[in-house]
């Protein structure tokens, strides 16, 4: 049974979508900036029709590894999922590996495609650059995601975001549109444009098929 709640905003994305939020947990963002990042994710979630039937969400914080807070198959009320997203911990680590989190997205989150009819999107919120030794397989993971029809949308935040990786992601597929922001302060301004873009990439649900009328048999 679908756990639904009334929409909180006029714009409300009711499409077939599996959306993964990937949050940079490096010290390139201060604790306060990470708070803005979390608020952005929660604000976005408020604008999605979250349920197992419509928009499924996952939330992952990444540093040198990946920490999943919400999985695509989690059957919880949207308000409860937003509450969990608001409690993502700030790691403030030296490194946030985009390669590791894309690998995690490829082999853990989208290992099995159980909703082929839905669009699959990874929103990669990145504010830092991983060391070169960690990025050896970066392109391989992006290509692997492309093979699984996972759209990767990088959102570069601030002066330390890895523009080279953002450009590589964009090159892989025309849908992989990047948003490059000078600071977390621009997230709120860009939110509606990002939500609209994601929503436009996802299919609408097909109309419900009605069972054929039973032929009446008279004896």
């Amino acid at each position: 049974e679908d756990i639904s709640e009334p929409p909180l905003h006029d714009f409300y994305c009711s499409r077939l979508l599996d959306l993964v939020f990937l949050l940079d947990g490096s010290s390139r963002l201060s604790e306060a900036e990470f708070e803005v990042l979390k608020a952005f994710v929660v604000d976005m979630m408020e604008r999605l029709r979250i349920s197992q039937k419509w928009v499924r969400v996952a939330v992952v914080e990444y540093h040198d590894g990946s920490h999943a807070y919400i999985g695509l198959k989690d059957r919880k009320r949207p308000s409860e999922l937003r509450r969990i997203a608001s409690q993502v911990k700030y790691a403030g680590s030296q490194v946030a590996s985009t390669s590791e989190v894309l690998k995690y997205t490829l082999f853990q989150i989208f290992s099995k495609i159980d909703r082929p009819e839905a669009s699959r999107i990874a929103l990669l919120l990145m504010a830092s650059q991983e060391p070169q030794r960690m990025s050896r397989n970066f392109v391989r993971y992006v290509q692997g995601l492309k093979k699984k029809k996972v759209i990767v949308i990088p959102v570069g935040i601030g002066p330390h975001a890895n523009l080279k990786q953002i450009r590589l992601i964009e090159k892989q597929a025309p849908e992989n549109k990047a948003f490059v922001l000078s600071s977390v302060d621009e997230l709120e301004q860009q939110r509606d444009e990002i939500v609209s873009y994601l929503c436009d990439l996802a299919p609408e649900a097909p109309p419900p098929t009605l069972p054929p009328h039973m032929a009446q048999v008279t004896v």
């Epitope: 604790e31 306060a32 900036e33 708070e35 608020a39 608001s86 911990k89 700030y90």
Partner: nanobody
Framework: QVQLQDSGGGSVQAGASLRLSCAAS????????MAWFRQAPGKEREFVGF???????LYSSSVRGRFTISRDNAKNTVALQMMNLKPEDTAVYYC??????????????????WGQGTQVTVSS
Amino acid sequence: QVQLQDSGGGSVQAGASLRLSCAASGGTFSSYAMAWFRQAPGKEREFVGFIGSDGSTLYSSSVRGRFTISRDNAKNTVALQMMNLKPEDTAVYYCAARARYSGIYYRETDYPYWGQGTQVTVSS
């Protein structure tokens, strides 16, 4: 369990400065995120600013550039330095605390611990 005590309010002329203070007791202060909110007469309580456990800050657009939040983890205090005050800053100011990670910075319902409030009146 944290107890918060606000102080430093008063009546000033427009353009003046004022420093509010909030003393915390009964918890590991350094592990808390702190915020200031205010409530003007007949209006809802609104977010003013936030300070993380690492000292990083956020401000509402209405006070940015005029107000500064700081904290002293050794003394278990957080301060709100208010400069170039305007009549529209007149309100009761509250400090609030929450565990580092549990919530959204501007949402008052995410802060379980509150000071009693201190009145700031700015006249033109």
